[in-house]
Amino acid sequence: SEEPPISLDLTFHLLREVLEMARAEQLAQQAHSNRKLMEIIGK
């Protein structure tokens, strides 16, 4: 897939890995919150 224009920003290159890790962490936290919510609703 075509890279977005922001990929030309040096920041994208220097922080690519940490941004991906931060996003993965954010998604994991969101999934955890969703599971907790489902548990509460399930009860």
Partner: antibody, heavy 118, light 112 residues
Framework: EVQLQQSGPELVKPGASVKMSCKAS????????MKWMKQSHGKSLEWIGV????????FYNQNFKGKATLTVDKSSSTAYMQLNSLTSEDSAVYYC???????????WGQGTLVTVSA | DVLMTQTPLSLPVSLGDQASISCRSS???????????LEWYLQRPGQSPKLLIY???NRFSGVPDRFSGSGSGTDFTLKISRVGAEDLGVYYC?????????FGGGTKLEVK
């Protein structure tokens, strides 16, 4: 011409929060990350964090995690930084900055002075 | 964190003189891609910082050629060949090779 126009000075009480803005013009807002800096009076510069205007993804310097929250409004090409639980240590000038393909902080706003005082 | 140490803290010069500012990093700032993301900024009194040099030795657009950057690894230098009144202010070195990105403490260039 690239311009980053920051909001005016803020005088806030300890424990309160403040939200400052940085309006970008002269380029496509979503083509570049926005970064924020802190400069305490007479001191050096500290990098706070960065935000991707496309999706709101953020990455913070650990020293500012929980202190600063970065957001954007794409419709108005404006970046925001909120600082919470303010103390005298947070009194400083805060800058928004933008890079290029070759350098990290090529363009700077004029700064927003935050004074925390009872 | 990478500590950036600048010397001297203050540099008194006569206009027209050459000035030299040193910046040392606490570890190598060569990035895994082979580049060294060392930048120099000038903050004039009452103004926002301005980019002078990126990747050790490249002048940003509009920066006069009297400014030159050099160095490698952990040791870097900014030279101003003929200091003008508009060059007075505080100079900062900065590294973007390792997160968190960090600045030096600054060197104040002032008239003798």
């Amino acid at each position: 011409e690239v311009q980053l126009q920051q909001s005016g000075p803020e005088l806030v009480k300890p424990g309160a929060s403040v939200k400052m803005s940085c309006k970008a013009s002269g380029y496509t807002f979503t083509d570049y990350f926005m970064k924020w800096m802190k400069q305490s009076h007479g001191k050096s510069l500290e990098w706070i964090g960065v935000i991707n205007p496309n999706n709101g993804d953020t990455f913070y310097n650990q020293n500012f995690k929980g202190k600063a929250t970065l957001t954007v409004d794409k419709s108005s090409s404006t970046a925001y930084m909120q600082l919470n639980s303010l103390t005298s240590e947070d009194s400083a000038v805060y800058y928004c900055t933008r890079g290029t393909a070759r350098a990290l902080f090529a363009y700077w706003g004029q700064g927003t002075l935050v004074t925390v005082s009872a | 964190d990478v500590l950036m140490t600048q010397t001297p803290l203050s540099l008194p010069v006569s206009l027209g003189d050459q000035a030299s500012i040193s910046c040392r990093s606490s570890q190598s700032i060569v990035h895994s891609d082979g580049n060294t993301y060392l930048e120099w900024y000038l903050q004039r009194p009452g103004q926002s910082p301005k980019l002078l040099i990126y990747k050790v030795s490249n002048r940003f657009s509009g920066v006069p050629d009297r400014f030159s950057g050099s160095g490698s690894g952990t040791d870097f230098t900014l030279k101003i060949s003929r200091v003008g009144a508009e060059d007075l202010g505080v100079y900062y070195c900065f590294q973007g090779s390792h997160v968190p990105w960090t600045f030096g403490g600054g060197t104040k260039l002032e008239v003798k």
